[in-house]
Interface confidence: low
């Protein structure tokens, strides 16, 4: 049913990550010539949504006034022209946080750490997860998974790094995840300043696995070695 | 003081639904999830599920999965367990209980359920 | 499921004793594990979470050992309102499982 039609842009505002109850939009722009907009959402009958574009005719808002389970998941959306329908465009993945209460994040042996030794950051859930994510404030692949291998779950998973230099200095915040869904996450957890000193004349580390041939340093705030602890787990890049 | 109150003992029908109330005090409810356990007579413990109460997330036990529904009401401060399609064998003391993380820390007094016509 | 497996099933003992009941998982459960003791027509009570660490009010002749699969429950110097029913219980991973249970009573 695609046609020739470019594919229209698809993104959430304030973002793609919403808390639980907070309200959403979701924007689809495609061309002048749209008749009409639709929504798909992933596993859910089609069309999801269904709306008439606003002028000037090039882009259509899907409103969720109240972030709930329900709408946490992967969209696509299409626009209609005289011509037919469009291709769809690239996948929105809105992400629902506060699904389950906030874990702990804490830092072993310490959150101040000497350039070229070795820090955990551990993450806690207060009930078993499959999945864990943490996160670094203003960086470009801020998310590191740990997921377990057979669906076990647990209540906690180790993000281990070294050498540690400066690059790994900032604000982390960690969720915590059920594999059945990742697209629903817990509260975050408090935040956690990782203090790096003595790092001046600290060269870069090298990952033990590519994280992305573009990013620079500050683009790669995690780079783990070593196995997991509890090894049910299993790291992902994401 | 943390304070977990439920009914007392309940009298149903064989093929009857109960709904088990849990009135919860002295904590902020929707902070910790609360578990249901059910003992019958003379024997072990075993864990139904729990619920969180700031958004309704379950997670069952999944033996009870077909057996049990757990839901709260946040302004009253009440979790609660429905028990359906009741038989003999559903006859046994229920708990609730305050997860601090799985471990139970504060439990309610109980409610005897027995199934009999 | 995670079975746990406690022993012994009863266990007779006199005020001043020293007893020790064990449990022991069917998987490694690292520490996630609880202890709990329940007197006649009583609700459970927490004694020890953690493995180790004992619950407020707890009396310190309770102690928690453990690790892996492995995992104890001391009582020193027994005393009269220590009789009772003592249950351990795993929250490693869901469903949350506990031992049948160990009778301690006076003997």
């Known amino acids: 049913q695609a046609g020739p039609l470019p594919k229209p842009t698809l993104w959430a505002e304030p973002g793609s990550v919403i808390s639980w109850g907070n309200s959403v939009t979701i924007w689809c722009q495609g061309t002048l010539e749209a008749r009409e907009y639709r929504l798909d959402k992933e596993e859910s009958p089609a069309p999801w949504d269904r709306q008439n574009p606003l002028e000037p005719k090039n882009k259509a808002r899907f409103s969720i006034p109240s972030m709930t389970e329900d709408y946490a998941g992967r969209y696509r959306c299409y626009y209609r022209s005289p011509v037919g329908w469009s291709q769809p465009s690239d996948p929105l993945e809105l992400v629902m946080t506060g699904a389950y209460s906030k874990p702990t994040l804490s830092a072993l042996p310490s959150p101040l750490v000497t350039s070229g030794k070795s820090v955990t950051l551990l993450c806690q859930s207060r009930s078993p997860m499959d999945t864990f994510l943490l996160i670094k404030e203003r960086a470009a692949h801020p998310l590191l998974h740990l997921r377990s291998e057979h669906g076990a779950q647990q209540h906690q998973a180790e993000f281990p790094m070294s050498p540690v230099t400066s690059v790994h200095g900032g604000t982390y915040r960690c969720f915590s995840s059920h594999g059945f869904s990742h697209y629903l996450l817990s509260h975050p957890s408090d935040p956690l300043e990782l203090i790096v000193s003595g790092s001046l004349e600290d060269p870069r580390p090298s990952p033990t696995r590519s994280v992305s041939t573009a990013a620079g340093p500050e683009d790669q705030p995690l780079m783990p070695t070593g196995s997991v602890p509890h090894s049910g787990l299993r790291r992902h890049w994401e | 003081e943390v304070q977990l109150q439920q009914p007392g003992p309940e009298l149903v029908k064989p093929g009857a639904s109960v709904k088990i109330s849990c009135k919860a005090s002295?904590?902020?409810?929707?902070?910790?999830?609360m578990h249901w356990v059910r003992q019958r007579h003379g024997k072990s413990l075993e864990w139904i599920g729990h619920i969180y109460p700031y958004n309704g997330n379950t997670v069952y036990n999944q033996r009870f999965k077909n057996k049990a529904t757990l839901n709260v009401d946040n302004f009253s401060s009440t979790a609660y367990m429905e028990l359906r399609s009741l038989t003999s064998e559903d006859s046994a003391v229920y708990y609730c209980?305050?997860?601090?993380?799985?471990?139970?820390?504060?439990w309610g007094q109980g409610t005897t359920l027995t199934v009999s016509s | 499921d995670i079975q746990m497996t406690q022993s012994p099933a009863s266990l007779s003992a006199s005020v001043g004793e020293t007893v020790t009941i064990t449990c022991r998982a069917s998987g490694n459960i690292h520490n996630f594990l609880a202890w709990y003791q329940q007197k006649q027509g009583r609700s459970p009570q927490l004694l020890v979470y953690?493995?180790?660490t004992l619950a407020d009010g707890v009396p310190s002749r309770f102690s928690g050992s453990g690790s892996g699969t492995q995992y104890s429950l001391k009582i020193n110097s027994l005393q009269p309102e220590d009789f009772g029913n003592y249950y351990c219980?795993?929250?490693?991973?869901?469903?949350?499982?506990f031992g049948a249970g160990t009778n301690l009573e006076l003997k």
């Open positions: 219980q795993h929250f490693w991973s869901y469903p949350f499982t």
């Open positions: 953690n493995a180790k």
């Open positions: 209980a305050r997860g601090a993380v799985g471990y139970f820390d504060h």
């Open positions: 002295g904590y902020t409810f929707t902070d910790y999830n």
